[in-house]
Every structure is written in structure tokens, then in C-alpha cells.
């Protein structure tokens, strides 16, 4: 999966929006049984925060062993710590499970920095605050790792929710969600509401805090406001989408839209930052600096390294611009835009300043592997991964952090021509998509 500031952490050609409004295809369609409504048992089933990932409680084996598992839409393996590690409170003990089956096969997953490796098997898996089902799923039992687990993160494994194409060691290893849909009546869809704190949390507060919701098999109306707008999943590997235009405070970056998707654009809950291709990042930072030019911030801040601190409660949100990403719509020549606030892209950092200070990291960073819409984007929105209809939906999250002047937004439709040209076609090679 994307590394850089990738969890596990070790941070166009599209036309201008016109007055012409197209018929919108959003929520006004026939309800499908089990897909919409209330999923009370699943609401608030995530904990954590953007900097260290969001995790859900899962049980593995018989009798069930409870583990906290990072929710990662940027990878496709279900992998859990299965040996003692200094950063793990607990781990999967295969020898204690009567239902464990060894696949007699190893798996090795390297990152730019760090790696994990383990042994493949299957076991019975359930999600206590999820659908009332148990499935036999593939599990990578992590026996060795480097810079994978995070000290104090409180999770012991990772749930890769993307498609089989990027599963390790190869696409024959069925991902958890595929197994879930095949073996049960759970609809082929899940949705995520990640709730950023908006202010620093200390360790005890994080452990006690609610981080959001993963609704498995449906959409919960209480988790969003306004309408859901859908963008096609371009290809079923990562959750790949197409960005057709980028604006900073309403000012178009005016780049060839291919640049926005070079070499892909993905929605990834396992990445902290909004990561942008080099050229796009440079243009975006230049524009953000210009919009906030009454202030000068240190160079290291824009690199995501130095923290800027304000006296508690005095963060000047108004000097920072909103950022809009226009996504390809479901209708020809139609797009919609999602707009995030500085409350999303300035990430609060705990434990550095006094209680008199609020300190933040700039959570937009440079990528060599395309655009990654990570937690800082997702924290603004309720995001529906509608695998059945090969599309991703966005609506304003009911829990997003904002102020009295501005709010995150999902708006459309906009007329945008030649959107297909915005996609980048990656040359087919044998290179690992994970070695990034």
C-alpha cells in the first residue's frame, strides 16, 4: 500500500463549473433491501484518530480471540500480529484456536520503510459490532515485522478492504470482504465515517474516544447530511477514482487533469494525509501559501515536519483556504466536488505543547505514486464503498470538524468535458504496487 505517510505510520482539463445543472443521480433511486437505513449496532464501532489509524474490534478463532484491527481501504490482506512484539498488547495465538487451518504458505510484504511477513491460514472471523455473521477468512499471521506496528496505537492487525488484485502474495488470496459477501447475505457494500478529533488528544483520551463508524453492508442516514454523490471506481484494485479539477479557495489550479491522477488516485483510510503528485503538491502549496500570505510559516511546516502552535482556541482557521477536489460523476460530462477545510488538512498533534497551545501538522504531502485521499479527506465525509455498483459515494459527514463560518461540502453537478482523458494508464509491468 502507499507508504510515505502511509499507515501503519512509521502525514485540469475539467471545465469550469457552469450554471447549467444536470439531472442528479444520487439518493433518488429505488431502495435496495438491507442497503439503507439504520445500523445502530455498527454506529461508533471505530476508535482511533487520523495520525495512527482507525480500528474496529474483531474476533478470530475458536474460542474467539478479540483483537483491534486497523481499517485499511488501501490494501487487501487481513493480517494480524501472531507473535509477541513490544508494541502489541495482545496477538493472535493460532495454537489456541480449534478452527485454525494452516495454508502452508508464507507471505512477505515490504514497504519503502519497513515490512511485515507471516504465515497464511484461515480461521473463523467475526465483527462484534458488525453484521451478526461468522465467516471463514484468510488470515496472514504476522510473525515478523519492522516499522509496521505503532507504539500506543492500540491496534494489533490490519483489515485490507480493497480488491484481490493487490492482495499478497497474489490475487488468488481472497480478501476478507469478498469472503464475507460470498458466505453470507451481507450486501457487497460498506461505508466509513471517520471522525477526526479536531483537537489534540492525549493517550488516555484516544483510548476512550469514539473514532467513527464502519457500516458493513449498508448506509446509515444518520451519519451524513445532504445528498450522496457517487464517482465511478475506475478499476477494481485499489479504490481508484478520477479527479478532474482541483481548486484552492475557488481558484482553479489549472493543471492538465492527468496530473491529478498520475499515476492513480485512490481512496485510502490507511493513509493519514492527502497525498498529491509532486507537480500538483507544489502548485497546491504555492496556492495555499498565497491564500494565507498575511502569515509566514516555516519551511518545515509545509513539508509536514514542523508543527505550528497557537494559543489554545486562537487557531486562525480563516486565513487558510478550502480545498476542492472535483470527481468524475456517474453521468457523462458531469462532475461533483468535495470541499475540505483547514480543520481537515491541519492535523492536531498531541503531547508536544502545553495545554495552553494547539499545535498542528500540515497534512498534505508529496507522493510519487499518485493522489491518495487519506484520512484527512475522509474525515470530512461519509464515504460509501459501493462495490456492487462499482462506485464510491461522498456526503458531508455528520461528525466533521468545522467552524461557524465554513463547512465541508459535497456539491454538484458541474459540467466537465473529456473527463475520461483525466485518467492515467499505468504501463503494465511486474513491479510491485506495494513497493512505494
Amino acid at each position: 500500500t502507499q507508504h510515505g505517510i502511509r499507515l501503519p505510520l512509521r502525514s485540469g482539463l475539467g471545465g469550469a463549473p457552469l450554471g447549467l445543472r444536470l439531472p442528479r443521480e444520487t439518493d433518488e433511486e429505488p431502495e435496495e433491501p438491507g442497503r439503507r437505513g439504520s445500523f445502530v449496532e455498527m454506529v461508533d464501532n471505530l476508535r482511533g484518530k487520523s495520525g495512527q489509524g482507525y480500528y474496529v474490534e474483531m474476533t478470530v478463532g475458536s474460542p474467539p480471540q478479540t483483537l483491534n484491527i486497523l481499517v485499511d481501504t488501501g490494501s487487501s490482506n487481513f493480517a494480524v500480529g501472531a507473535a509477541p512484539h513490544p508494541f502489541l498488547h495482545r496477538y493472535y495465538q493460532r495454537q489456541l484456536s480449534s478452527t485454525y487451518r494452516d495454508l502452508r504458505k508464507g507471505v512477505y510484504v515490504p514497504y519503502t520503510q519497513g515490512k511485515w511477513e507471516g504465515e497464511l491460514g484461515t480461521d473463523l472471523v467475526s465483527i462484534p459490532h458488525g453484521p451478526n455473521v461468522t465467516v471463514r477468512a484468510n488470515i496472514a499471521a504476522i510473525t515478523e515485522s519492522d516499522k509496521f506496528f505503532i507504539n500506543g496505537s492500540n491496534w494489533e492487525g490490519i483489515l485490507g478492504l480493497a480488491y484481490a488484485e493487490i492482495a499478497r502474495p497474489d490475487d488468488s488470496l481472497e480478501p476478507f470482504f469478498d469472503s464475507l459477501v460470498k458466505q453470507t447475505h451481507v450486501p457487497n457494500l460498506f461505508s466509513l465515517q471517520l471522525c477526526g478529533a479536531g483537537f489534540p488528544l492525549n493517550q488516555s483520551e484516544v483510548l476512550a474516544s469514539v473514532g467513527g463508524s464502519m457500516i458493513i453492508g449498508g448506509i446509515d442516514h444518520s451519519l451524513y447530511t445532504g445528498s450522496l454523490w457517487y464517482t465511478p471506481i475506475r478499476r477494481e484494485w485499489y479504490y481508484e477514482v478520477i479527479i478532474v479539477r482541483v481548486e484552492i479557495n475557488g481558484q482553479d489550479l489549472k493543471m492538465d487533469c492527468k496530473e491529478y491522477n498520475y499515476d492513480k488516485s485512490i481512496v485510502d483510510s490507511g493513509t493519514t494525509n492527502l497525498r498529491l503528485p509532486k507537480k500538483v503538491f507544489e502548485a497546491a502549496v504555492k496556492s495555499i501559501k498565497a491564500a494565507s500570505s498575511t502569515e509566514k510559516f516555516p519551511d518545515g511546516f509545509w513539508l509536514g515536519e514542523q508543527l505550528v502552535c497557537w494559543q489554545a482556541g486562537t487557531t486562525p482557521w480563516n486565513i487558510f483556504p478550502v480545498i476542492s477536489l472535483y470527481l468524475m460523476g456517474e453521468v457523462t460530462n458531469q462532475s461533483f466536488r468535495i470541499t475540505i477545510l483547514p480543520q481537515q488538512y491541519l492535523r492536531p498533534v498531541e503531547d508536544v505543547a502545553t495545554s495552553q497551545d494547539d499545535c498542528y501538522k500540515f497534512a498534505i504531502s508529496q507522493s510519487s505514486t499518485g493522489t491518495v485521499m487519506g484520512a484527512v479527506i475522509m474525515e470530512g465525509f461519509y464515504v460509501v464503498f459501493d462495490r456492487a455498483r462499482k462506485r464510491i459515494g461522498f456526503a458531508v459527514s455528520a461528525c466533521h470538524v468545522h467552524d461557524e463560518f465554513r463547512t465541508a461540502a459535497v456539491e454538484g453537478p458541474f459540467v466537465t468535458l473529456d473527463m475520461e482523458d483525466c485518467g492515467y494508464n499505468i504501463p503494465q509491468t511486474d513491479e510491485s504496487t506495494l513497493m512505494t
Partner: antibody, heavy 120, light 108 residues
Framework: QLQLQESGPGLVKPSETLSLTCTVS??????????WGWIRQPPGKGLEWIGM???????WYNPSLKSRVTISVDTSKNQFSLKLSSVTAADTAVYYC????????????WGRGTLVTVSS | EIVLTQSPATLSLSPGERATLSCRAS??????LAWYQQKPGQAPRLLIY???KRATGIPARFSGSGSGTDFTLTISSLEPEDFAVYYC??????????FGGGTKVEIK
């Protein structure tokens, strides 16, 4: 080459306002690459950051002094100033003005400093 | 709040000797740390920034190392003019307001 020079009274009475000016010569205070700051050092003690200003007028202050400090800039005179109100003997120190460079993080150029004594 | 602790408080050495000064941060400051030299009656002077980069005009005998929480200023061979007080400063959290308490390097 760029130089900084502090000026102002060396003696201030308790409860009054300390006022100092830093004159920048050999370069422009309107540089977009720098802040301009004040640091003080009580006799025989360490360094304490007071605050800093950007040519646009944007200011940052030490929270422990914020209620008493005002830093201002006059780009036409290439000067920036410090005012510290309600002074006590604890404010007796050598006051330095400095340029904040190297990615607006480090004090890369300092004035010689001026001793301000608070006494009646 | 990040606290910088310098040690030793005083270092007594002879000219030509190697001086090793330590600055420890209460939590990681990455590489955002500077060292300043202050001679009696003078303003401080920037020696090292970003933990290991020498400022303009600083002799090669001064070097900085470290990252995270532990930093070292080394003077490879003390010259008479190097006897002074040395301060570290972190700018990981900005604005740049945190200095260490200082280390005095005196002639033995």
C-alpha cells in the same frame, strides 16, 4: 551587509512601559523570507524569546508575556519595535533584536543588545 | 511543552581539547535544533541549525549531530575564542521559543 541595532531608554520605572526600537540597515525589513524578533536575557541567566513580527504586521508572542507585549513594524523606516507594559524588576535584562531566517526558524542575525534596567 | 536540558552545566577544558556538549529534548524534535554561542558581553551567534548544518562563516571545528531527542555539539579542538556559553534551541514546535539552559565552556 545586514545589521540590526537596538535603541531605547536604559532605565524604566516600575509599572511603566518599556519601549525599544530595532533599526535594520543593509537590507529590507520587507523580506518575505524573514521574521524579526525580540529575545531577552536577564543578568546571568538564559535566553527568553519575547515575540516576533512579519513585515505584513503578523505577530507571534510568548504566551507568558502576551498580555503585556506589543511588537509593531514600520516598513517605511525599516524598523520594528517592542513595547512591554507594567514592567517590574523581573523585566531587567539585555534585550536583543534578531532576524529569524533559515526557513523562518532560527535566529541567524542578532543586534548587539541593550541593557534595560527597571528601577525607581 | 518540550523542555531542553543541556549538560554538563559547565565544561572545564584546555585549548586543543575536544569539547562535547549535550542537549536532550523531553520528546522528539526531529532535526529541528540549533546551537548558539555567546561570549561575555556579546549577543548570541548561530553556529548550527537543523541539528548538523553549519551556519555561514562558522569554522569546520564546530559540528552538530543527533536527531529525535539527543543532540551533540562537538568542538573538535578548542581555540581560545571558543570559551563561551552555548545554548541549544528547538523549533520543531513553532514559533521558535524554546532554549536550553546553556553550557559554559571554561578554561581549565
Amino acid at each position: 551587509q545586514l545589521q540590526l541595532q537596538e535603541s531605547g531608554p536604559g532605565l524604566v520605572k516600575p509599572s511603566e512601559t518599556l519601549s525599544l526600537t530595532c533599526t535594520v540597515s543593509g537590507g529590507s525589513i520587507s523580506s518575505s523570507s524573514h521574521y524579526w524578533g525580540w529575545i531577552r536575557q536577564p543578568p546571568g541567566k538564559g535566553l527568553e524569546w519575547i515575540g516576533m513580527i512579519y513585515y505584513s504586521g503578523s505577530t507571534w508572542y510568548n504566551p507568558s508575556l502576551k498580555s503585556r507585549v506589543t511588537i509593531s513594524v514600520d516598513t517605511s523606516k525599516n524598523q520594528f519595535s517592542l513595547k512591554l507594559s507594567s514592567v517590574t524588576a523581573a523585566d531587567t535584562a539585555v534585550y536583543y533584536c534578531a532576524r529569524v531566517g533559515h526557513g523562518v526558524s532560527y535566529f541567524d542575525l542578532w543586534g548587539r543588545g541593550t541593557l534595560v534596567t527597571v528601577s525607581s | 511543552e518540550i523542555v531542553l536540558t543541556q549538560s554538563p552545566a559547565t565544561l572545564s577544558l584546555s585549548p586543543g581539547e575536544r569539547a562535547t556538549l549535550s542537549c536532550r529534548a523531553s520528546q522528539s524534535v526531529s532535526s529541528y535544533l540549533a546551537w548558539y554561542q555567546q561570549k561575555p558581553g556579546q549577543a548570541p551567534r548561530l553556529l548550527i541549525y537543523d541539528a548538523s548544518k553549519r551556519a555561514t562563516g562558522i569554522p569546520a571545528r564546530f559540528s552538530g549531530s543527533g536527531s529525535g531527542t539527543d543532540f551533540t555539539l562537538t568542538i573538535s579542538s578548542l581555540e581560545p575564542e571558543d570559551f563561551a556559553v552555548y545554548y541549544c534551541q528547538q523549533v520543531y514546535t513553532w514559533p521558535p521559543r524554546t532554549f536550553g539552559g546553556g553550557t559554559k565552556v571554561e578554561i581549565k
